[in-house]
Interface confidence: medium
C-alpha cells in the first residue's frame, strides 16, 4: 500500500498496537496494569461469565451507537445484573389473576448498590426470557407511576419462536428516575396490546421465571433466567476523575467558533453559490454554512510515557487509538435546494453537506 | 493554525469550495450546471416554496442519519408531496362515526407518479398537522392490511400544545410495499391508544383537514395543511446511472479483507493481549480483532476536470467534499472484558474498540 510515501505496514501495526495499549488503560483510568497478586486460582465464577456473555450478546445484536460520544461514554462501563424481586414475595399476590399482563417488581436499594449515583448510569436494560411460542402477539411495556397509574415505555411485535429468546428493553431513563427517588419497590408491567375494538386481550407470551413453572425451571438456572436489569455504569472512583480532569469538549460550532483552538476543530465557512462558485442556478438557498474540519490530532506514544496526564489526552486527541489520527467530520446535516430543469422547478435533498462538528478519528 | 507545515487557510478554503462544486454536481449527476434559459421570471411558485420549507423543517428537527450511507443515498433526492384523498370522497363515509380513530386514504397511482419504482424511494414520511390541544394523549398509527386488519406502525405521546404542530411518522417501508403492489386506495389509521382497563378510548387529538372544520381551514391553506406524504426519491434518470456506473463499495471487512484494495480500506489486525501487549490481566477475551483504517483518499480537483468520470469518483474518494480527505473508521463496535481488581472480578464494556468499516472523510 502506498500514499505519497511508502507505508511501512509493520510500523503502522506497531503504532496501532501501542495506541491500543494506551487506549485501554486510559478508558479504565489506570496508569499501569493492575497487580495480579491477589487473583484467586481456578476458572472465572459462573455468574461473572454469565454476565460477560450477556454483555457480549448485546454487542452482537446491535450496531455501533453512532451518536457523538459524551465524555463519560469514552470510559469503560462496569456491568452488573439486578434480579427481579422473587416471585414468592407477597407483593405479587394481587397481580396473579390478571390475564392481560405480567408484573415485575424491583428493589431500588439493589439497584443503588450497583449504581450509587444517578448520573453514573450509562445504560439499563430490562431483560426477559420469552419461552417458545406458536402465536404472534403485539406486547407493551409500562412503568408504574404514582397514584397507581402506568406510563407507556415501548412495544414489540413478537413472532412465533421454536426456542426461548431474550427480549431487551432500554429502561435507562426509568432506572435513572428511580435512583433519583427514595428507596422502595418499583414495577414494570408487560402487557398484551389492547386494541380499541378487539375482545381478546389476553397475554399469550410466557416469560421464564414468571409464567407457570416448567420442569427444569428451578434453582440457579431458573434464577439466571428470571427477568433482570442489566446495568452499565461508570464506577464511582472513575467518576470522580471526570469532574477533576480536563474535560473533553464537543468539537462543535458552539465551542470551535468561539475559541482559538489550534487542534482539531470545526472551522467556519459560508458558501455563497453566486460569489464562491459563480452559480446562479440554485434558487434556494442563496448559500449555506458548509464549514470544514481542520487542526492536528497528535499521535500519543504510550510506550514510554504511561502517565495519567498523557493518558487523559487520548480521550480528546486519539479516542479511536488510530495509528495516525485525523481531524474529520462527526455530525453532518443535509441541505435541501431548489433548482430548475428546463421550466420545471425541483426540490432535492443533498445528504451530508453541512459539517456541524469534528472529531479526531 | 499549524500542523507540521504551516497551513495556508485561504488555500484550504479554496480547496473546500472547489470540492463542494464537484460534490453538488456529482450528487445531482450533472456534468455541468443546467442551462437557465427557460426559467420563468418572477418568484418561485408557492407550492415549491412550501415543499422546500417542509424539507428544511425536517432537517431542523432531526440529527444527521448516522448509518453507513448506501451508494444511492449519496445522490440527491427529489422531494415531492402526495396529499391524502380529499375528505369529500365517499370512501370516508363509513369512518366518520368512529370516535377512537381518524382515517387517511391515499391513492397509490399518485405516489407512483412521484416514485415510479419501489427501490428509488429513499424516505417517506406521513405528516399530520395537529391543532392546539389542552390534553395529553397517547396515540398510535396503523396501516391498512388485507382482509380488513390493521398493522401497528408506531406511537407517540402527545403533550398539550398552544399552537398547531406537525407530527411526522416514518412510513418508508409501508409506501415501498404499496409501490410493490398494484395501484389502488391504501389507508392509515391514527388512533387513541386503547388500554386494557381504560374505558375512555376516544381520540381527543384534532388533525387539520380531518377534524371538524374550523374557520380559515378552507381552500389552498387547508389543502397545504391536510395530511400528506413527504417523499424523497432518486429520480428515474439518476437511478439508471446507479446500475451502470462503477459501484461505491462498503469499505468493510467483507470487502477489504478479501481484496487487494490499495485505497482506503479496513485492514486486519488481531490483538493478542499476552503476545502483543505483554498483558495477562485481561481474563476474557484473550484478544480481539481491533483492525485499523489505511489507504489514500485522493483529493479530486473539480475546477478544470468537470467530467462525468471524475465526478463519479467523489462518491468513493471524497463524499464529504473535504479539503484533505482522510481514511477513518466508520462503523465501530464495543468490547466487553473481564479483569480483576484485587479479588473482585469486574465486567466492563469498552466503547468503540473494534473497527468494522472505514470511509474517506
Amino acid at each position: 500500500l502506498s500514499t505519497c510515501k511508502t507505508i511501512d505496514m509493520e510500523l503502522v501495526k506497531r503504532k496501532r498496537i501501542e495506541a491500543i495499549r494506551g487506549q485501554i488503560l486510559s478508558k479504565l483510568r489506570l496508569a499501569s496494569p493492575p497487580s495480579q497478586g491477589e487473583v484467586p486460582p481456578g476458572p472465572l465464577p459462573e455468574a461473572v461469565l454469565a454476565l460477560y456473555n450477556s454483555t457480549r450478546d448485546r454487542v452482537a445484536g446491535e450496531s455501533a451507537d453512532p451518536e457523538p460520544e459524551p465524555e463519560a461514554d469514552y470510559y469503560a462501563k462496569e456491568v452488573t445484573r439486578v434480579l427481579m424481586v422473587d416471585r414468592n414475595n407477597a407483593i405479587y399476590e394481587k397481580t396473579k389473576d390478571i390475564s392481560h399482563s405480567i408484573y415485575m417488581f424491583f428493589n431500588t436499594s439493589d439497584i443503588r448498590e450497583a449504581v450509587p449515583e444517578p448520573p453514573l448510569l450509562s445504560r439499563a436494560e430490562l431483560r426477559l426470557q420469552r419461552l417458545k411460542s406458536s402465536v404472534e402477539q403485539h406486547v407493551e411495556l409500562y412503568q408504574k407511576y404514582s397514584n397507581n397509574s402506568w406510563r407507556y415505555l415501548g412495544n414489540r411485535l413478537l413472532t412465533p419462536t421454536d426456542t426461548p429468546e431474550w427480549l431487551s428493553f432500554d429502561v435507562t431513563g426509568v432506572v435513572r428516575q428511580w435512583l433519583n427517588q427514595g428507596d422502595g419497590i418499583q414495577a414494570f408491567r408487560f402487557s398484551a396490546h389492547c386494541s380499541c375494538d378487539s375482545k381478546d386481550n389476553k397475554l399469550h407470551v410466557e416469560i421464564n421465571g414468571i409464567s407457570p413453572k416448567r420442569r427444569g425451571d428451578l434453582g440457579t438456572i431458573h434464577d439466571m433466567n428470571r427477568p433482570f436489569l442489566l446495568l452499565m455504569a461508570t464506577p464511582l472512583e472513575r467518576a470522580q476523575h471526570l469532574h477533576s480532569s480536563r474535560h473533553r469538549r464537543a468539537l462543535d460550532t458552539n465551542y470551535c467558533f468561539s475559541s482559538t483552538e489550534k487542534n482539531c476543530c470545526v472551522r467556519q465557512l459560508y458558501i455563497d453559490f453566486r460569489k464562491d462558485l459563480g452559480w446562479k442556478w440554485i434558487h434556494e438557498p442563496k448559500g449555506y454554512h458548509a464549514n470544514f474540519c481542520l487542526g492536528p490530532c497528535p499521535y500519543i506514544w504510550s510506550l514510554d510515557t504511561q502517565y495519567s496526564k498523557v493518558l487523559a489526552l487520548y480521550n480528546q486527541h486519539n479516542p479511536g487509538a488510530s495509528a495516525s489520527p485525523c481531524c474529520v467530520p462527526q455530525a453532518l446535516e443535509p441541505l435541501p435546494i431548489v433548482y430548475y430543469v428546463g421550466r420545471k422547478p425541483k426540490v432535492e435533498q443533498l445528504s451530508n453537506m453541512i459539517v456541524r462538528s469534528c472529531k479526531c478519528s | 493554525l499549524s500542523t507540521c507545515k504551516t497551513i495556508d487557510m485561504e488555500l484550504v478554503k479554496r480547496k473546500r469550495i472547489e470540492a463542494i462544486r464537484g460534490q453538488i454536481l456529482s450528487k445531482l449527476r450533472l456534468a455541468s450546471p443546467p442551462s437557465q434559459g427557460e426559467v420563468p421570471p418572477g418568484p418561485l411558485p408557492e407550492a415549491v416554496l412550501a415543499l422546500y420549507n417542509s424539507t428544511r423543517d425536517r432537517v431542523a428537527g432531526e440529527s444527521a442519519d448516522p448509518e453507513p450511507e448506501p451508494e444511492a443515498d449519496y445522490y440527491a433526492k427529489e422531494v415531492t408531496r402526495v396529499l391524502m384523498v380529499d375528505r369529500n370522497n365517499a370512501i370516508y363515509e363509513k369512518t366518520k362515526d368512529i370516535s377512537h380513530s381518524i382515517y387517511m386514504f391515499f391513492n397509490t397511482s399518485d405516489i407512483r407518479e412521484a416514485v415510479p419504482e419501489p427501490p428509488l424511494l429513499s424516505r417517506a414520511e406521513l405528516r399530520l398537522q395537529r391543532l392546539k390541544s389542552s390534553v395529553e394523549q397517547h396515540v398510535e398509527l396503523y396501516q391498512k392490511y388485507s382482509n380488513n386488519s390493521w398493522r401497528y406502525l408506531g406511537n407517540r405521546l402527545l403533550t398539550p400544545t398552544d399552537t398547531p404542530e406537525w407530527l411526522s411518522f416514518d412510513v418508508t417501508g409501508v409506501v415501498r410495499q404499496w409501490l410493490n403492489q398494484g395501484d389502488g386506495i391504501q389507508a392509515f389509521r391514527f388512533s387513541a391508544h386503547c388500554s386494557c382497563d381504560s374505558k375512555d378510548n376516544k381520540l381527543h387529538v384534532e388533525i387539520n383537514g380531518i377534524s371538524p372544520k374550523r374557520r380559515g381551514d378552507l381552500g389552498t391553506i387547508h389543502d397545504m395543511n391536510r395530511p400528506f406524504l413527504l417523499l424523497m426519491a432518486t429520480p428515474l434518470e439518476r437511478a439508471q446511472h446507479l446500475h451502470s456506473s462503477r459501484h461505491r463499495r462498503a469499505l468493510d471487512t467483507n470487502y477489504c479483507f478479501s481484496s487487494t484494495e490499495k485505497n482506503c480500506c479496513v485492514r486486519q489486525l488481531y490483538i493478542d493481549f499476552r503476545k502483543d501487549l505483554g498483558w495477562k490481566w485481561i481474563h476474557e477475551p484473550k484478544g480481539y480483532h481491533a483492525n485499523f483504517c489505511l489507504g489514500p483518499c485522493p483529493y479530486i480537483w473539480s475546477l478544470d476536470t468537470q467530467y462525468s468520470k471524475v465526478l463519479a469518483l467523489y462518491n468513493q474518494h471524497n463524499p464529504g467534499a473535504s479539503a484533505s480527505p482522510c481514511c477513518v473508521p466508520q462503523a465501530l463496535e464495543p468490547l466487553p472484558i473481564v479483569y480483576y481488581v484485587g479479588r473482585k472480578p469486574k465486567v466492563e464494556q469498552l466503547s468503540n474498540m473494534i473497527v468494522r468499516s472505514c470511509k474517506c472523510s
Partner: antibody, heavy 120, light 112 residues
Framework: EVQLVESGGGLVQPGGSLRLSCAAS????????VHWVRQAPGKGLEWVSH????????YYADAVKGRFTMSRDNGKNTLYLQMNGLKSEDTAVYYC?????????????WGQGTQVTVSS | LPVLTQLSSMSGSPGQTVTITCTGS?????????LSWYQQLPGTAPKLLIY???NRASGVPNRFSGSKSGNLASLTITGLQAEDEADYYC????????????FGGGTKLTVL
C-alpha cells in the same frame, strides 16, 4: 398508434428453452411497466410476469418462478421472456401487454400473441 | 380455482341489459386495488374495457359500464348487440398472493 408485436414462439420439447420477444412502438416504452399474460388452449387468461418501467423490479407467478426471466431493453423498445425448463403445462398463447399508467396492472394495449407448444 | 369468481356463461337477447359479476375478497377487489374488465372476441387478443372499476377505456361505447361494492365488481352492458358476443374477464392485483395479479375464470357471453 400503440403496437406490441410478439415473436419467438414455437414447438419445444419438455425441459427445453425458448426466448420470446415483444417489439413496442407508438409510445414511450421506457415510461411503462409491461407484462406477459398467457392463455392455454380453451382456458382463461393467466398472468405470468411483470417488469417495471426502468427494469428495476420484476415479479413472477409462482408457476414460472425460477424458470422464466423477464427483461427489457429500453434502447431497442423490446421486451423479452427467457423460458427455461419448459413443461407441457406451459403450452399457451403468450401475450405481452402494456400498463395503462406506469405500473397500474391495467393492460390498455395487447400484442396479437405468440404460440408456445411444449410437447415430446 | 380462480381467486376471482365469475359465472362461466351467460346469455341475453339483443337490446337487453346484462350484468356480469366478479366476486373477490378483501385482499383484491375489497382491498381497493384497481379492477379491470377485458373483452376477448373469438380468435383475438383481449381488449381493455373498464379500468379502475368504473372508468371506460378510450373508444369503448358507453353501453359498457363498471361498478364496485365491497368485494363484488360488476360489468353492465345495456342495449346488448350481436358484436358483444365474447369472453369477458375481470382482473385485479391480489396482495395475499405472491403471484400478484389474478384474472377471473372468464364469462362466455352469448347473444341469442
Amino acid at each position: 398508434e400503440v403496437q406490441l408485436v410478439e415473436s419467438g414462439g414455437g414447438l419445444v420439447q419438455p425441459g427445453g428453452s425458448l426466448r420470446l420477444s415483444c417489439a413496442a412502438s407508438g409510445f414511450t416504452f421506457s415510461n411503462y411497466g409491461v407484462h406477459w399474460v398467457r392463455q392455454a388452449p380453451g382456458k382463461g387468461l393467466e398472468w405470468v410476469s411483470h417488469i417495471s418501467a426502468a427494469g428495476i423490479s420484476r415479479y413472477y407467478a409462482d408457476a414460472v418462478k425460477g424458470r422464466f426471466t423477464m427483461s427489457r431493453d429500453n434502447g431497442k423498445n423490446t421486451l423479452y421472456l427467457q423460458m427455461n425448463g419448459l413443461k407441457s403445462e406451459d403450452t399457451a398463447v403468450y401475450y405481452c401487454a402494456k400498463d395503462r399508467i406506469r405500473s397500474s396492472y391495467e393492460y390498455d394495449s395487447w400484442g396479437q400473441g405468440t404460440q408456445v407448444t411444449v410437447s415430446s | 380455482l380462480p381467486v376471482l369468481t365469475q359465472l362461466s356463461s351467460m346469455s341475453g337477447s339483443p337490446g337487453q341489459t346484462v350484468t356480469i359479476t366478479c366476486t373477490g375478497s378483501s385482499s383484491n377487489i375489497g382491498g381497493g386495488y384497481y379492477l379491470s374488465w377485458y373483452q376477448q372476441l373469438p380468435g383475438t387478443a383481449p381488449k381493455l374495457l373498464i379500468y379502475n372499476a368504473n372508468n371506460r377505456a378510450s373508444g369503448v361505447p358507453n353501453r359498457f359500464s363498471g361498478s364496485k361494492s365491497g368485494n363484488l365488481a360488476s360489468l353492465t352492458i345495456t342495449g346488448l348487440q350481436a358484436e358483444d358476443e365474447a369472453d369477458y374477464y375481470c382482473g385485479c392485483y391480489d396482495s395475499s398472493l405472491s403471484t400478484g395479479y389474478v384474472f377471473g375464470g372468464g364469462t362466455k357471453l352469448t347473444v341469442l
